[in-house]
Interface confidence: low
């Protein structure tokens, strides 16, 4: 009896979503299963369908299968949020590009290779042929699409509207060549799903046929989508499991970019004189072991046996024997010139937070004029005479041109957050330096903090509709959601901006999350005509220790009368004690009975040393925190969630005040809780908005 | 209770094949892999590789070339073949019971163990 | 391939004494390691696992330790049942499983 082939690894999976018709007409099928696995083979095979499927979803709450002639990407459907729902459509419906020769291409590209419009199949003007839909069932002989039913060399092709040119094959790409990685392809998350020898990849989150320690829920950030090539742990490039019981695991063709530049989030901090966190970074030129043998060199095989080669590591940089960390081990090691000991780990470097003589600045670092010219994140920075313009941009006074030379860490701008720099990075216009304050420097950044002098509020007033305040009073705040679950709060500052709280990115992999806007309900409910949904496009993280996070969206949110921004404090600005505040949250943690609506918990604000007082003298405030406290027993942020805001009023003019973040206690009587103060870093946040580029609508 | 019952020859010659077969009783042996693991005179262990219900094997890299893991779950037995035997390859060969998932790779059950003598 | 070092290769112990035995991976395992114990004619028999989590039927004498690359397994009160030979093994990186080459626990 011939195994019947298992087809879910030919399906995109997106979990805990389903499609919608939005148009009657469309069909749908169901029927009582018990795995997604019987979906999928009976969508593969079109057994028992009256139409084409194209995508399915499984139900698993009622163990049932709604099988579908269209994807997310057709028309008249939209998708939507279920738990109980996993959503898969056929890899080839969605694929731009084409697999060996293309015979299982089934995307929407209907030009020729030299621009001509394509024929429909079904059509016998202006060329007659015997490429009828009816006669070739299972190649999608739909519309006027390129396909290549046969499997012929050129791969997909079609006839041509053109009556003086027959058919003319698709200019569409190889899968290998539209992908492509850098340095070893750690951070890879293209939709490579076969290997070199052109085996089909295992899905990640199967366990057959191989076994394997690589759970897409035990590794969140490493980007086990379905069975796309990825290369979780430090092999010279991505790899999968594969669908043959006697290959284990192969590695894929992916080429390497063109500008082999390594991603931002990759890049760990470079440091030759010490060791940041792991080491990875480690650029320095020891290369003896603790104990004082010699390393063997990275290029060599003698007296050990090894694939960490440069060839095989690149960017990772195995120069001659130096002591290095090119897998995520503890620290750099390297092999020795021992042949009784293989590796050895390289701990007489010191650690980067234990070395002394460090560059440091005092005050906010305006007169700096040490040599680092590396951004916090490993950037190398750009010359200052290239950003002239962009600087004066933001700055109203003439920069001191004669501090700012080659491309240093400066601070012409007067951050508060001290020394910065240009990047040359378009995604990265600039970040600040890996320096810290001197120890012992007690120059207040801020001044006048303790009194009230600068008002919190600008002159505006808080918008009403027919005299009577719309949901835009809660319109600015946003579920942030990781994996279809809210796991933050948020508030929209700016149509593509959403301040919250560092701690709320567990994975590395943007895709992971969506900013849900206009709702009331934690799970959409009854929000479903006010609800936009958006993916984020990139997080900016804010000034060391400062707990915040920019969360850029992919595109600008419609602001109505659902969705509207917050306001920022005035840079520096004192809220009076005793000024009414609220928290907000969906507290989707807490609560037994929680009905899933957005809670507000009223606060008022108190004194840094008073709040001091209050925690029993265990807690020290300093300029870039405040505190509120509660009147009534079991309100709090606590209830609220992390990233969400403290909105206090003044003028009639509401403003985010504080950031919810996690380790400050809750707002419990005589325990204040505290927050990021948002006022301390509004600089920051303005200078972000104006010299980060956003998507248009 | 688990039990694993291996038998087969236990002297050979140089270039001969080896081979031993170990049945399980009692446990559920779809779930699990099944191992083989040996160990010269007076020395430690070394695993050769394994096999789950559905013929999926991995093997040692420095044993691959000569080494062909089957299972019969017909009889709820699994049988390890070594090609080409040298002296070195003389051992005490265990069948063992390892985990089903990744975190499991460690081995609750084993055989009594078959002495392998290659000797010309 | 992950290389496993045990330490030392003999432990001298009186009975109703501790042991201490040692096992050193070559790179992290994690927590991914056993334990297990081999008197003279027998088949191995598990002891620990996860690093610190004593398998079905092992006295609570026996504990273990450790993460990483560095892992201790450690006998609070010696029996005259525990003098044999113990073996660490690693399964977080495979294929292929790889052994420590055994440290003997003999009679002081």
């Known amino acids: 009896q011939r195994k019947r082939r298992n087809t879910i690894h030919e399906f995109k999976k997106s979990a805990k979503t389903t499609l919608i018709k939005i148009d009657p007409a469309l069909k749908i099928k169901t029927k009582k299963v018990n795995t997604a696995d019987q979906c999928a083979n009976r969508c593969t095979r079109n057994k028992g369908l009256p139409f084409t499927c194209k995508a399915f979803v499984f139900d698993k709450a009622r163990k049932q299968c709604l099988w579908f002639p269209f994807n997310s990407m057709s028309s008249g459907v939209k998708k939507e949020f279920g738990h109980e729902f996993d959503l898969y459509e056929n890899k080839d419906y969605i694929r731009n590009c084409i697999i060996g020769k293309g015979r299982s291409y089934k995307g929407t590209v209907s030009i020729t290779k030299s621009g001509i419009k394509c024929q429909p199949w079904s059509s016998m003007i202006p060329h007659e042929h015997s490429f009828l839909p009816s006669s070739y069932r299972g190649k999608d002989l739909q519309e006027n699409y390129c396909r290549n039913p046969r499997g012929e060399e050129g791969g997909p092709w079609c006839f041509t509207s053109n009556p003086e040119v027959r058919y003319e094959v698709c200019d569409i790409p190889q899968c290998s060549e539209v992908e492509c990685m850098t340095c070893n392809g750690e951070s890879y998350r293209g939709l490579m799903d076969h290997t070199e020898s052109g085996k089909i990849c295992q899905r990640w989150d199967h366990q057959t046929p191989h076994r394997h320690k690589f759970l897409p829920e035990r590794y969140p950030d490493k980007g086990f989508d379905d069975n796309y090539c990825r290369n979780p742990d430090g092999q010279p490039r991505p790899w999968c499991y594969t669908l043959d019981p006697h290959t284990r695991w192969e590695y894929c063709a992916i080429k390497t970019c063109a500008d082999n530049t390594m991603n931002d989030t990759d890049v760990p901090l470079e440091t030759t004189e010490c060791i940041q966190g792991q080491g990875e970074g480690y650029r320095g030129t020891v290369n003896t072991i603790w104990n004082g043998i010699p390393c063997q060199r990275w290029d060599s095989q003698y007296p050990h046996e090894h694939d960490m080669t440069p060839e095989n590591f690149k960017c990772k940089d195995l120069r001659e024997n130096y002591c290095r960390n090119p897998d995520g081990s503890e620290s750099p090691w390297c092999f020795t010139t021992d042949p009784n000991i293989r590796v050895g780990y390289c701990s007489q470097i010191p650690n980067c937070d234990m070395s002394h003589g460090q560059d440091c600045y005092r005050g906010n670092g305006k007169n700096y004029m040490g040599n680092l010219s590396q951004t916090r994140s490993g950037l190398t920075c750009s010359m200052w005479d290239k950003n002239m313009e962009d600087l004066h941009r933001h700055i109203f006074w003439e920069p001191d041109a004669s501090k700012l030379n080659e491309n240093y860490c400066r601070n012409p701008d007067d951050d508060a957050h001290g020394p910065w720099c240009y990047t040359g990075n378009p995604l990265i216009p600039w970040d600040y330096c890996p320096i810290s304050r001197c120890e012992g420097d007690t120059t207040p950044t801020i001044v006048n903090l303790d009194h009230p002098v600068i008002s919190c509020a600008k002159t505006k007033q808080l918008r009403v509709v027919n005299g009577i305040p719309t949901r835009t009073n809660i319109g600015w705040m946003v579920s942030l959601r990781y994996r279809n679950k809210h796991i933050c709060g948020g508030s929209l500052i700016k149509e593509s901006w959403v301040l919250t709280a560092r701690q709320c990115f567990p994975s590395r992999d943007l895709k992971d999350y969506e900013a849900w806007l206009g709702i009331h309900d934690v799970h959409g409910r009854g929000d479903e005509k006010c609800k936009q949904v958006l993916n984020v496009s990139q997080l900016v993280y804010g000034p060391e220790g400062s707990d915040l996070v920019l969360m850029k969206l992919a595109r600008p949110a419609v602001l109505d009368d659902f969705v509207s921004t917050i306001d920022l404090p005035n840079y520096g600005c004192t809220i009076p004690e005793k000024t009414s505040c609220s928290v907000y949250g969906w507290g989707y943690t807490g609560l037994i009975n929680y009905d899933g609506l957005l809670r507000v918990a009223h606060l008022y604000i108190m004194g840094n040393e008073k709040c001091s007082q209050h925690h029993r003298g265990k807690v020290t405030l300093n300029e870039s925190e405040i505190c509120a406290g509660a009147e009534k027993i079991g309100s709090g942020p606590c209830e609220g969630d992390y990233g969400g805001p403290l909105v206090c009023e003044q003028h009639k003019m509401r403003m985010v005040l504080g950031v919810i973040v996690p380790g400050r206690g809750c707002a419990i009587p005589n325990r204040p809780g505290i927050f990021v103060r948002v006022a301390y870093y509004a600089k920051w946040i303005h200078k972000i908005i104006l010299t980060y580029k956003v998507p248009q609508s | 209770q688990v039990q694993l019952q291996q038998w087969g020859a236990g002297l050979l010659k140089p270039s001969e094949t080896l081979s031993l077969t170990c049945a399980v009783y009692g446990g559920s042996f779809s779930t699990y892999y099944w191992s083989w693991i040996r160990q010269p005179p007076g020395k430690g262990l070394e695993w050769i590789g394994e096999?789950?219900?559905?013929?999926?094997?991995n093997y040692n890299p420095s044993l691959k070339s000569r080494v062909t893991i089957s299972v019969d779950t017909s009889k709820n037995q699994f049988s390890l073949k070594l090609s080409s035997v040298t002296a070195a390859d003389t051992a005490v060969y265990y069948c063992a019971r390892g985990g089903y998932d990744f975190w499991s790779g460690y081995y609750d059950y084993w055989g009594q163990g078959t002495l392998v003598t290659v000797s010309s | 391939e992950i290389v496993m070092t045990q330490s030392p290769a003999t432990l001298s112990v009186s009975p109703g004494e501790r042991a201490t035995l040692s096992c050193r991976a070559s790179q992290s395992v994690s927590s991914n390691l056993a334990w297990y114990q081999q008197k003279p004619g027998q088949a191995p028999r598990l002891l620990m696992y996860g690093a610190s989590t004593r398998a079905t039927g092992i006295p609570a004498r026996f504990s273990g330790s450790g993460s990483g690359t560095e892992f201790t397994l450690t006998i609070s009160s010696l029996q005259s049942e525990d003098f044999a030979v113990y073996y660490c093994?690693?399964?977080?990186?495979?294929?292929?499983?790889?052994f420590g080459q055994g440290t003997r626990l003999e009679i002081k």
């Open positions: 096999i789950n219900h559905s013929g999926s094997t």
């Open positions: 093994q690693q399964y977080n990186n495979w294929p292929p499983i790889t």
